[in-house]
């Protein structure tokens, strides 16, 4: 309830997160023209990436372009990229949709198609669909510990969401354990009314809202957080127009003195932690 006699002050906050969990990934691996099932283990260092501000990212799916080398090769024949003669290819041209710089030559991509040759990381990335179901769909069972320190400078009051009495093995539950600051990712989605398995394919953005409504008067002191969750990206975006959340990164290595890279298009959930609230004192 609004106490008009109190002096209110907005919260100043800092957030630190720690994600835990292991995923086993089974995918098709092609070596020397032979495709077989490959098994790999993903730990925190493999699927989380440091982000700026009050955010963390968990990779739930990926598409790899392995063994790329800087050389010349045909551009991937995406829509509008095919050619029939060199006239269609402009030397030095960098098409924003392309993955390289055109050499001016129209060359065979495969048996039936020709595309402009580019100087690029080759072979250029194919336009592949994100795997369905998501490769790291078991990320649903990962947990995140959220440490949230807050401060009201005008009232000279500081506290945090983690209490000394808290059990390190607890898991947040809206009813049974609303003060536990360890959250199962699947539960976050369930609370927000979203399907983790579905969002994991293309990625998305999930908001974790921490609301502090603090009464700092000594006779009726109360200052504990309330957690709520909601999806922040537009899930209704037309499928053809950049759905979900993804980015690319590369792992570089040398093989026979040739610099190579594996390009990874990572799909996943960016969790934005939004802290707001006020502290009131007479």
């Amino acid at each position: 309830s609004d106490k008009l006699y109190q002096r209110k002050e907005p919260v100043i906050s800092s957030v630190h997160t720690k994600v835990k969990g292991i995923a086993e990934v089974t995918e098709n691996v092609t070596e020397g023209g032979v495709t077989k099932l490959g098994h790999s283990i993903f730990d925190t260092a493999d699927y989380t990436f440091p982000l700026q501000g009050n955010s963390f990212f968990v990779m739930t799916n990926y598409v790899k372009s392995e063994g790329q080398v800087q050389t010349l090769c045909p551009e991937y024949p995406r829509r509008g990229a095919q050619c029939s003669s060199d006239r269609r290819c402009k030397k030095g041209w960098m098409d924003p949709q392309s993955k390289g710089i055109q050499t001016g030559r129209c060359v065979p991509y495969d048996k039936t198609r020709k595309t402009c040759e580019v100087s690029a990381w080759c072979p250029t990335e194919e336009e592949k669909e994100a795997p369905r179901p998501a490769l790291l769909r078991s990320a649903e069972n990962f947990t995140v510990l959220i440490k949230n320190n807050i401060h009201f400078p005008g009232h000279n009051y500081t506290t945090r969401n983690i209490l000394p009495t808290m059990n390190g093995s607890c898991t947040f539950h809206k009813t049974w354990d609303p003060q536990c600051s360890i959250f199962r990712l699947g539960d976050i989605f369930q609370e927000a009314g979203e399907n983790f398995t579905e969002v994991a394919v293309q990625g998305g953005i999930m908001g974790i809202e921490i609301y502090w409504d603090c009464n700092l008067d000594s006779w009726s002191h109360h200052c504990r957080p309330r957690y709520s969750f909601r999806r922040l990206d537009d899930k209704n975006t037309d499928e053809s127009f950049v759905p979900g959340y993804n980015f690319r990164y590369a792992k570089y290595y040398k093989e026979n003195n040739v610099e190579k890279r594996t390009l990874i298009k990572a799909f996943g959930i960016r969790f934005d932690i939004l802290v707001f609230g006020t502290g009131g004192k007479f």
């Epitope: 010349l72 090769c73 030559r105 065979p108 991509y109 040759e117 080759c122």
Partner: nanobody, 115 residues
């Protein structure tokens, strides 16, 4: 799938020359040669992009082997000179998407260099 047929292998004396040829069933961006000596892994020898641009050679054959292409005929040749006994191997023709990346290989042709 691209079909590749190699020819030109044989027995030659050290210091001699040999020319290998390969015909592909369809046009392809890059064509190249690999070799495999007994008890060793298959290794890259030489590769050529479309119209012979770019070309790439293994350090061990630079200055001795020359790769050339005929796009119109979908063929690639490997002119080998100054042959050494360590060049003895089965030579495979290959096609791919760049001079570093190959998907299809032929059956191979034997080259033996005697000392």
């Amino acid at each position: 799938e691209v079909q590749l047929v190699e020819s030109g292998g044989g027995l030659v004396q050290a210091g001699g020359s040999l020319r290998l040829s390969c015909a592909a069933s369809e046009r392809t961006y890059s064509m190249g040669w690999f070799r495999q000596a007994p008890g060793k892994e298959r290794e890259f020898v030489a590769g050529s992009g479309w119209d012979g641009i770019p070309t790439r050679y293994a350090d061990s054959v630079k200055g001795r082997f020359t790769i050339s292409r005929d796009n119109a005929k979908n063929t690639v040749s490997l002119q080998m000179s100054g042959l050494k006994p360590e060049d003895t191997a089965i030579y495979y023709c290959a096609t791919g998407t760049s001079v570093y990346h190959y998907q299809y290989w032929g059956q191979g042709t034997q080259v033996t260099v005697s000392s």
